[in-house]
Every structure is written in structure tokens, then in C-alpha cells.
Amino acid sequence: EVEKTACPSGKKAREIDESLIFYKKWELEACVDAALLATQMDRVNAIPFTYEQLDVLKHKLDELYPQGYPESVIQHLGYLFLKMSPEDIRKWNVTSLETLKALLEVNKGHEMSPQVATLIDRFVKGRGQLDKDTLDTLTAFYPGYLCSLSPEELSSVPPSSIWAVRPQDLDTCDPRQLDVLYPKARLAFQNMNGSEYFVKIQSFLGGAPTEDLKALSQQNVSMDLATFMKLRTDAVLPLTVAEVQKLLGPHVEGLKAEERHRPVRDWILRQRQDDLDTLGLGLQGGIPNGYLVLDLSVQEALS
């Protein structure tokens, strides 16, 4: 806490200007009026205050707005935002996307801090859903943002917002998240033609069910191995050798290199060795001829 002292003669600030960088902390406390600071917050960013000086300015704003800052002040916080705690931010009501952008810009190039996470949470909750413009903004600043949300939070993403998602935004998503996102993507891209549709849906396919993979295999999509390896194991297992061959097209020969990894390993174990041999890749581990194939999923359900 800065001690209350009288402002020296001639030092009372009439505007927020560069002269304040030469004020000691106690002089800022004594000579800068909080209401003046609030109305001229947009000037603060261009003035090279030290972090100690910014602490004093924050303290003045806290005293003026004990219930939380108004958006007119929040929008112009700039580097002062780095001084805010999650507790401070929880008092805010941020509704403007411009305000959100301005504050994310301050944190640009850094990991998502607890302050930023709280800000985003407040903003999204205030909007009620993760609309396209918000998602666009958030993924531009934090490509991994989408994958940091729980499946429950992702359920509030409208299909129209999926257009803002880039492949790299899904890099760290787990299958549970893709399970939620895939149906939304399918809905969002449903009016596109075959090849265009596949380009858009490809990065969401980790959430696709078997029947959709079967349908894709009929469309000459030539799925690459990287995408295939991210498919749900339970969705891949029922696919026939012929369907996988059609799905992968020329990339089918990549199966050999992945035969020890899931889902390829598990899929091989479910195929007749005769059928695997038709691929001519030397894949081993299929069901020998004359063996009876039991549907393991039925077995598991009964046990």
C-alpha cells in the first residue's frame, strides 16, 4: 500500500501524459486523480511506465471501482491487464469482442495465463455460446484453445462456428473432444461436394463413426496415413480390407509401417489373413483360414 502524502506544488496531473514517467510512486499516488486516469486510460499504453508505476495506477482504479472496472476502462487497460489477477477479472462484465481482442493482444506471444483463461471464460459465459467471431478470435491468438475446452463446453459451439476452425486448432484434441466436434463439422459442411467436403472434414475425423468411414470409402478420398492413425479404434475395427483399401487409396501401402500401432494393429487382428494378403503388403497377424470369427463387441456386452 502506498502511503498517502500531499502532492508537491505544481505536480498535480491535469492529464495523463509522458511527464508521469518521472514521478516517483508516492507522487503518482498523490498527484494523479483516479477519475482522470479512468477517462484517459487510452493514453497509458503509449507511456513507458515501469511495472511499479503501473501497480500504483492499478491501485487507483481499484479504489475507484471496487465492484469491478467498467468496459470503457477495461478496453484500454493495455499492459495494465498483466497486473490483474483472476479475482479482479471475475468482477468484470466484458461483452465487446473489440475489448477481448485488445486484451489478448497484450498477452500475445505468451502462453495462456490464468488471467486470460478467466477473461475468456467470463466473455464466453456472457455471450452464452462460442459464436464464430469469438472462436475466430480465440483460435487466432491461441491455436490450441478449442482443445482446452471440456466436451461439455464444446457442446455449446454452434455448427456455424466450425468454419473458423483450422486443422492446427485440433492438433491437441483428444477423442472425447472430437466426438463432440465431428457431428457439428458434418452438419456445417454438409452442402459441400465430395472432395471439398473431405478437405474440410478431414481434421475432425477422429470423432467419426464406422458408417461415416464406410461412406467415405466409396468416394475415392485417398485419406493419408496420419489421418487414418487418428481415427477411433472402435470405428476402424468393423471396416473390411476392401473398405480400408478404398479409403486410403494409394496411401494403403503405409499400413505396413504402422502395423504394430493402433488402430492398425487392432484392425489387422480382426481381418482374415486371406483378405490381408490381397493387399500384397505382407501384413501379418490376421485370423487364419478356417477359424470362426466371433463378434467381440457382442461377447463383451454379454459378459
Epitope: E15, D17, E18, S19, I21, F22, N45, A46, I47, P48, T50, Y51, G78, Y79, E105, V106, K108
Partner: antibody, heavy 115, light 112 residues
Framework: QVQLVQSGAEVKKPGSSVKVSCKAS????????FSWVRQAPGQGLEWMGG????????NYAQKFQGRVTITADESTSTAYMELSSLRSEDTAVYYC????????WGQGTLVTVSS | DIALTQPASVSGSPGQSITISCTGT?????????VSWYQQHPGKAPKLMIY???KRPSGVSNRFSGSKSGNTASLTISGLQAEDEADYYC???????????FGGGTKLTVLG
């Protein structure tokens, strides 16, 4: 429109002093920070010091401490830079610039130090 | 004394993008967001192109952008044009000395 107009070129003898002026127009003068920056021929920019006119007290780069004096006259909106004990390596173009971000610059004043 | 480190020269063809780096310390570039970039054509005064790391003054083309990571700031010029050929200086406000520090300057050559 903000303008910073500097005084004309000077030729000085080693050991003497030079005083360069910078007149500001088109904006408030008193509360801005005015810097002086020099650039020797073919060299980079070098900050010398600066002043906030309404306070009158200047701050200087350590290299020039004791040899440079920066002042300002609020009534004429003019900043001054005086460099003493001149030597040949002080031959340079001297610029004044407004604000810590240096958003406006004067046209420059060439000071030549030669015997 | 040159406090910030810049490459002496960079070059690019018209239409290309180039990036100029500026490395300082945690007490100038790294610790604060008060980095500026200046363009200087031969025989002319420097011109402010970027301030506060990434803000553009009005009248400066949006082909110029600034960013910062750790103790290194960067100026990126996209869609290079012949008139971009100039010297570029980074500058930062150093709180320790309450003054400005500059990089040594980078000569940008636009090829062709």
C-alpha cells in the same frame, strides 16, 4: 499537423560549443518528452538525452553526462541542445524527436567539427 | 553504445516478406512492451513505423507489423516494394537509465 523545425547547419572548432534549437508547432509542447538523437556519418542512431518542458529538468545518456545540456522554453515551444568541448568525432547530424516513442522528428542539423 | 542487436543487412524480392530481429535484455526489450521501429531513407530523418511493439501510427501501411517474443522484437514487412529499401532501426525505452536505446540498424535491400 505537428512539425519540429531545427536550426541550420554549423561548423565548429574543436573545444568549442554548439547550441541547436528545435521549434515545435501543431501540438501541445509542455507535457511531451523531447529527445535529442545524433547520427555520425554512415553510423546508427545514438540517444543523447531528453526533457519534459513543464518540469525543465532533463535526463542524459551516461556517455554525454557533463558535456550536454538540454533545455526548453515553454513560451516559444522550443527545445535546445548544447554540446560542449567538441571534438572531431562529434561531427554528426543532430535530431530532435517528440515523445518517448519518437513519433515526430526534426529535419536534422549537421554539426561539423573541424580545425 | 549499441544496446540492441540487429542484423546488419537483409534482402528480399518485390512481393516477398522479410523479418528483421532486434535482441535486447529483460530490462529493455524483454521486460516491457515499449519497442519502436524506425525507417530511414538516405539523407532523411527517421520515421516511426511501429510503436509499443505492434502498433502502427496512422498513415503507415499495414504491410508493416511488429511482434515480440522474450527478449527479441521483430519487424515484418510483407509484399516488399522498392520504396521499402532503407535502413531500419529498433529502439526501446530502458527503464534502468530512463532513456532510449537503439539497435545498430539493418539495411534492407529490395532485389531486382
Amino acid at each position: 499537423q505537428v512539425q519540429l523545425v531545427q536550426s541550420g547547419a554549423e561548423v565548429k572548432k574543436p573545444g568549442s560549443s554548439v547550441k541547436v534549437s528545435c521549434k515545435a508547432s501543431g501540438g501541445t509542447f509542455s507535457s511531451y518528452y523531447f529527445s535529442w538523437v545524433r547520427q555520425a556519418p554512415g553510423q546508427g542512431l545514438e540517444w543523447m538525452g531528453g526533457i519534459i518542458p513543464k518540469f525543465g529538468s532533463a535526463n542524459y545518456a551516461q556517455k554525454f553526462q557533463g558535456r550536454v545540456t538540454i533545455t526548453a522554453d515553454e513560451s516559444t515551444s522550443t527545445a535546445y541542445m548544447e554540446l560542449s568541448s567538441l571534438r572531431s568525432e562529434d561531427t554528426a547530424v543532430y535530431y530532435c524527436a517528440r515523445r518517448t516513442s519518437m513519433d515526430y522528428w526534426g529535419q536534422g542539423t549537421l554539426v561539423t567539427v573541424s580545425s | 553504445d549499441i544496446a540492441l542487436t540487429q542484423p546488419a543487412s537483409v534482402s528480399g524480392s518485390p512481393g516477398q516478406s522479410i523479418t528483421i530481429s532486434c535482441t535486447g535484455t529483460s530490462s529493455d526489450v524483454g521486460g516491457y512492451n515499449y519497442v519502436s521501429w524506425y525507417q530511414q531513407h538516405p539523407g532523411k530523418a527517421p520515421k516511426l513505423m511501429i510503436y509499443s511493439v505492434s502498433k502502427r501510427p496512422s498513415g503507415v501501411s499495414n504491410r508493416f507489423s511488429g511482434s515480440k517474443s522474450g527478449n527479441t522484437a521483430s519487424l515484418t514487412i510483407s509484399g516488399l516494394q522498392a520504396e521499402d529499401e532503407a535502413d531500419y532501426y529498433c529502439g526501446a525505452w530502458a527503464h534502468m537509465s530512463l532513456g532510449k536505446v537503439f539497435g545498430g540498424g539493418t539495411k534492407l535491400t529490395v532485389l531486382g
